[in-house]
Amino acid sequence: PRSIDVKYIGVKSAYVSYDVQKRTIYLNITNTLNITNNNYYSVEVENITAQVQFAKTVIGKARLNNITHIGPLDMKQIDYTVPTVIAEEMSYMYDFCTLISIKVHNIVLMMQVTVTTTYFGHSEQISQERYQYVDCGRNTTYQLGQSEYLNVLQPQQ
């Protein structure tokens, strides 16, 4: 069998809402994956499991089942959404994300995704992880790749 390539493309959109009483931020983060089947037979994308971390804390998880099949030598782009919660334990983040004197409230999140594919009863898992910028201060739609976090250092605010 030839490889099945999984490429994490980036954040497509992030929609934010707040619970002022709980000082909590809710971010619905939609990500894009490209899955390429380099084989001469179809493969099933059985599930995608994803999680998002902020400051080494898992803030969101998602699982998609029975997603699609990919034909021979074909590629499919798949969007998946991870609902995340930055809760009261990170109270300072509520201040940051709702601060009107800052215009771009970028935070660095680690996106982790595992794709499980099956073919002829054989199962294969491919994982990716990537750091991404997400604006926690307003709803944002990104050009693919625009939110990539390239810097080794913490971003300047």
């Epitope: 000082r23 201040d95 215009k103």
Partner: antibody, heavy 119, light 112 residues
Framework: EVQLVESGGDLVKPGGSLKLSCVAS????????MSWVRQTPDKRLEWVAT????????YYPDSVKGRLTVSRDNAKNTLYLQMSSLKSEDTAIYYC????????????WGQGTTLTVSS | DIVMTQAAFSNPVTLGTSASISCRSS???????????LYWYLQKPGQSPQLLIY???NLASGVPNRFSSSGSGTDFTLRISRVEAEDVGVYYC?????????FGGGTKLEIK
């Protein structure tokens, strides 16, 4: 209904100190940043302080830095402005205002409290 | 600091007709995120300022749609389509693109 009620304004001599208060009601005070804005006798508006909802971020213009201190007590739904080394230029109506993070600005203002600095 | 400039008085308007109030900033208020950080407040006689317009062209909650606002990065106009008696007061533009946040000197709406 959002309500902001300022108090503490007075006649003070130059060099004196004063503490203004603003009691908030009708909304979850601990979830909103707050500001103080003053209106001088010539009706000009001047932003003088802002404080984030949990007091993690505080900003002042250079004109008042070191003389004015903003603080808040979320348990008491109260915003404060401690003023020291007062000058005649500080004479104004002082308004407290709530920041709306969706609008990105101050959306509700109190009725104001008057400070007069004069010998 | 960003300087906001307004005329002290509007051209006198008749009730029921339209009015325009202008404001100019010394620097573009258009951020790279596409938002223009320009605001309009109205201070009615004996009252505190009330928000009319946020981020250059958005009507604040409860504000009648007789009010509208437009502009470039530095030149802005507030329009009142049919002036009513209750619109009398001083209109302030403000910016919060950069600290310190600054206000215009205010324009008093004059009724004929």
């Amino acid at each position: 209904e959002v309500q902001l009620v300022e108090s503490g304004g007075d006649l003070v001599k130059p060099g004196g100190s004063l503490k203004l208060s603003c009691v908030a009601s009708g909304f979850t005070f601990s979830g909103y940043g707050m500001s103080w804005v003053r209106q001088t006798p010539d009706k000009r508006l001047e932003w003088v302080a802002t404080i984030s909802s949990g007091s993690f971020y505080i900003y002042y213009p250079d004109s008042v830095k070191g003389r004015l201190t903003v603080s808040r007590d979320n348990a008491k739904n109260t915003l404060y402005l401690q003023m020291s080394s007062l000058k005649s230029e500080d004479t104004a109506i002082y308004y407290c205002a709530r920041q709306n993070f969706y609008y990105g600005c101050e959306d509700y203002w109190g009725q104001g409290t008057t400070l007069t600095v004069s010998s | 600091d960003i300087v906001m400039t307004q005329a002290a008085f509007s051209n006198p308007v008749t009730l029921g007709t339209s009015a325009s109030i202008s404001c100019r900033s010394s620097k573009s208020l258009l951020h790279s995120n596409g938002i223009t950080y320009l605001y309009w407040y109205l201070q009615k006689p004996g009252q505190s300022p009330q928000l009319l317009i946020y981020q250059m062209s958005n009507l604040a909650s409860g504000v009648p749609n007789r009010f509208s606002s437009s502009g470039s990065g530095t030149d802005f106009t507030l329009r009142i389509s049919r002036v009513e008696a209750e619109d009398v007061g001083v209109y302030y533009c403000a910016q919060n693109l950069e600290l310190p946040w600054t206000f215009g000197g205010g324009t008093k709406l004059e009724i004929k």
